[in-house]
Amino acid sequence: DAHKSEVAHRFKDLGEENFKALVLIAFAQYLQQCPFEDHVKLVNEVTEFAKTCVADESAENCDKSLHTLFGDKLCTVATLRETYGEMADCCAKQEPERNECFLQHKDDNPNLPRLVRPEVDVMCTAFHDNEETFLKKYLYEIARRHPYFYAPELLFFAKRYKAAFTECCQAADKAACLLPKLDELRDEGKASSAKQRLKCASLQKFGERAFKAWAVARLSQRFPKAEFAEVSKLVTDLTKVHTECCHGDLLECADDRADLAKYICENQDSISSKLKECCEKPLLEKSHCIAEVENDEMPADLPSLAADFVESKDVCKNYAEAKDVFLGMFLYEYARRHPDYSVVLLLRLAKTYETTLEKCCAAADPHECYAKVFDEFKPLVEEPQNLIKQNCELFEQLGEYKFQNALLVRYTKKVPQVSTPTLVEVSRNLGKVGSKCCKHPEAKRMPCAEDYLSVVLNQLCVLHEKTPVSDRVTKCCTESLVNRRPCFSALEVDETYVPKEFNAETFTFHADICTLSEKERQIKKQTALVELVKHKPKATKEQLKAVMDDFAAFVEKCCKADDKETCFAEEGKKLVAASQAALGL
């Protein structure tokens, strides 16, 4: 339905508070380097303009598209060329090319200082002094560091952030109350950002069809009692929501997400029995709850899939009549029967089925040709099952830190050209699959593990795309979205890699390591491990373990010493020499 003024329409639908928050997120995700105050000024100007349009939709410029209005506003920033360089050239373009240009300049790894958490009292004072500014700053800092963060979900995080401060700043022990909550929000936020980044990559790099296939599989697992037509409607609406958010259309996205939550709750009887609690919550909590809702129970007496998709003489006729609908039905039927499979596995099975039909429906005897298609699924199912079994056994044997180290070595040997910070970040996240998923029973392990790995490997892909250094990474990232994990798993040691020159500075440590948190200390050690492998890719597990054990002992010893700095200098030299000898450097 067309509105005379789009900006007025969204302002009225969303309300002033959400409107302002979403515009701030949008601007911070586009202009990631701009100071907070500049963004607040721009948001206030847009909000005032929106109010004039609400008062009179025929007022000047009120009929302009949101992209035009927002783009024009962003292009008024005085320091655009100095701060962003070639991004300033976007402003010479017309819509829709201008918005596409801004999108292309979003930076997944912006050069921004790490967010340092102030003392609790300092935070509580700032919160009480100006709650609105404090919360806006949260939105701004998260949005600029995570330019694809799912905006309506960021509103939910901000609501929880506010609730944490409201509660804890009145508590007897503020820190004990607040810090665990902030840690939880930080970890959940990173996970949410990474999950959304995969959705946007799926849409932007592989197209709407790929995203829709993912959504059919996931929603069919989650809502196995829903009819195919119902799932298809939800998929269409969900695709629109994520296309908008990934395209920077955050007001439309938030509005449509609210409409979708409303529809789901109004029709929960034909969707899922698990939605009741979610649907009793306020809007932001409701949408979040629906997105995370557990899978409904599978209907009893689901018939054999083979009847319609293998044994039926009408397979090729049905396929030819409406290929995507028929494949969608196949994916829906398979997924609702298999909550124990990862979404990416279900998509691989659907792709295999499609390939078989393409070949067989052109054959002399189609039925004879596709009769054994389900047999082709067996190795595809067994591969992730075996991989997860092996890796969970390794995780249980080593624990998270050493499991991460095993993955660090494995991935550095596969793609040694990738930057050390990226290898550390990605391998640490890959290693978290153990504590996240291995505790689950068999039936939940694969969807947990493989779909999580897809999210983490997408981080590698988007970081690598910014500065491509490895053809192997590019190949695994671009060839097939659903085969990324098997592609990386299949990579062996890169025999073409020329070992990095040894640099003693890389292995020089100082007393500041002693004051770091356990996590930061681990990262330092893991950085050293990656560098070791880059110097000596052929080093054995045993050699690397010996060096790392020596390194851990060295850090422990020097952190206990009276003169820490001297200890690090002297013992450090010895350690480097011993390590070089041990590795034959």
Partner: antibody, heavy 121, light 110 residues
Amino acid sequence: EVQLVESGGGRVQPGGSLRLSCAASGFSLSSNAMGWVRQAPGKCLEYIGIISVGGFTYYASWAKGRFTISRDNSKNTVYLQMNSLRAEDTATYFCARDRHGGDSSGAFYLWGQGTQVTVSS
Amino acid sequence: IQMTQSPSSLSASVGDRVTITCQSSESVYSNNQLSWYQQKPGQPPKLLIYDASDLASGVPSRFSGSGSGTDFTLTISSLQPEDFATYYCAGGFSSSSDTAFGCGTKLTVL
């Protein structure tokens, strides 16, 4: 006892609609394709269409557009929705269980007793 | 698609061997997707033969079917009193939309 029972038949005016039901007992409908066949008084059997276990529907060319087959596995029932009825649709309507699950083999091994539909003004 | 049965009616005596034929205007699916039914007045049809020659459960062995492609035969080796009825053939074709019945052969006592 394994059986199919049709219901919903009766007299209807030309241009009217009727929804026939076929309730299964003693077995689950979800394991076989279910078809509808009709027989005008003293005439041949006439295939109307079939619904597969997964809900794919197939209709005789003359039935397409006016007749719709659906199923509700939770109720163990199959339906035949008939619209724009004409005098020549007067017949006994049978539901039947096909040997196959995903298509029509023409081999219906379990039949209901039928329900009479009369279209007249 | 047409299914033509012949004869349309037939009189015979108990103990006789009876043959009914069915011809389709195009080949049935897999050359064998043809069924035979028996129907008595006021009753639904009863499946006798499927896949051209396979005997349905509970059907006496005096009934047999043969044929392939477009031409099929139902044979009753030795007529029994309960066999007097109308017999229909039905063919399954490459599309489930095309399933078709013949118009029947009425078997009466001579």
